[in-house]
C-alpha cells in the first residue's frame, strides 16, 4: 500500500486518574503506513527517556494502516511540577516532525 502519514493527538491524564496518584499522558498516532514511527516525549522542553511505553495495533483490515499509542507515565507529584507536555512524531511520510502539546491546567 501507499505511504500514509500519521494523524497525531495528545491526551492529558484524567482527573479520575490523578486522584489515584499517577498521571498518564497519551500520544496517539492514527492510520499510518509503513509501521515505523518514532515518538519522543518532552516535558518543559526536556527530552524524556525510559518512562514511556508504546503499543502498536496490527494492520487495519480495511486500509492496512497502523495505529500507535505512546504513554508517558509519571507520579501525580512529578506531573504537577511541570507545565508543557509534548510528543514529537517522526515518520517517513512527514517532511518534518509533528509536535502536539498541551499546557497542564489549561485543557
Amino acid at each position: 500500500r501507499t505511504v500514509a502519514a500519521p494523524s497525531v493527538f495528545i491526551f492529558p491524564p484524567s482527573d479520575e486518574q490523578l486522584k489515584s496518584g499517577t498521571a498518564s499522558v497519551v500520544c496517539l498516532l492514527n492510520n499510518f503506513y509503513p509501521r515505523e514511527a518514532k515518538v519522543q516525549w518532552k516535558v518543559d522542553n526536556a527530552l524524556q527517556s525510559g518512562n514511556s511505553q508504546e503499543s502498536v495495533t496490527e494492520q487495519d483490515s480495511k486500509d492496512s494502516t497502523y495505529s500507535l499509542s505512546s504513554t508517558l507515565t509519571l507520579s501525580k507529584a512529578d506531573y504537577e511540577k511541570h507545565k508543557v507536555y509534548a510528543c514529537e512524531v517522526t515518520h517517513q511520510g512527514l517532511s518534518s516532525p509533528v509536535t502536539k502539546s498541551f499546557n497542564r491546567g489549561e485543557c
Epitope: K38, Q92, S95, S96
Partner: nanobody, 120 residues
Framework: QVQLQESGGGLVQAGGSLRLSCEAT????????MAWFRQAPGKEREFVAI????????YYSDSAKGRFTISRDNAKNTVYLQMNSLKPEDTAVYYC?????????????WGRGTQVTVSS
C-alpha cells in the same frame, strides 16, 4: 559538509516523462533512506516516494503510485525519480531528502530542489 543536489527538472507536456536525479556528497550513503518530496505554490511540502538503503524497499504516495519509480545507485551516491504520464497537477519544486535512520523519517538533509512544470 553534506550536500544533496537535484537535477533533471524542466518543462514538459502533459503525458510526458522526466527523470530526476539527486547526488549526495559528504554523506555516508550506506544505511540511509532517500526520499523525494514536492511542493506546489501555496501548498505544503508533500511526500512522493522513498527508497530504503537496501534498495529493495520502496514506498510511494497515492499520487505517485503506478506513474513514478524511485531507484538508487549506491556506487554513485545517487537516487533517481522516473516520472511518467505527467499531469499538470505534478507541477512543483521537487526536493530530495536523506533519512540517516533509514526508517523513521528523520530527514536531516535536504536539497535545494528542482522545478518541474507540466503544461497542458
Amino acid at each position: 559538509q553534506v550536500q544533496l543536489q537535484e537535477s533533471g527538472g524542466g518543462l514538459v507536456q502533459a503525458g510526458g516523462s522526466l527523470r530526476l536525479s539527486c547526488e549526495a556528497t559528504g554523506l555516508t550513503f550506506s544505511g540511509v533512506a532517500m526520499a523525494w518530496f514536492r511542493q506546489a505554490p501555496g501548498k505544503e511540502r508533500e511526500f512522493v516516494a522513498i527508497i530504503r538503503w537496501s534498495g529493495s524497499t520502496t514506498y510511494y504516495s497515492d499520487s505517485a503510485k503506478g506513474r513514478f519509480t524511485i531507484s538508487r545507485d549506491n556506487a554513485k551516491n545517487t537516487v533517481y525519480l522516473q516520472m511518467n504520464s505527467l499531469k499538470p497537477e505534478d507541477t512543483a519544486v521537487y526536493y530530495c531528502a536523506a533519512d540517516p535512520s533509514d526508517r523513521f523519517g528523520e530527514y536531516d538533509y535536504w536539497g535545494r530542489g528542482t522545478q518541474v512544470t507540466v503544461s497542458s
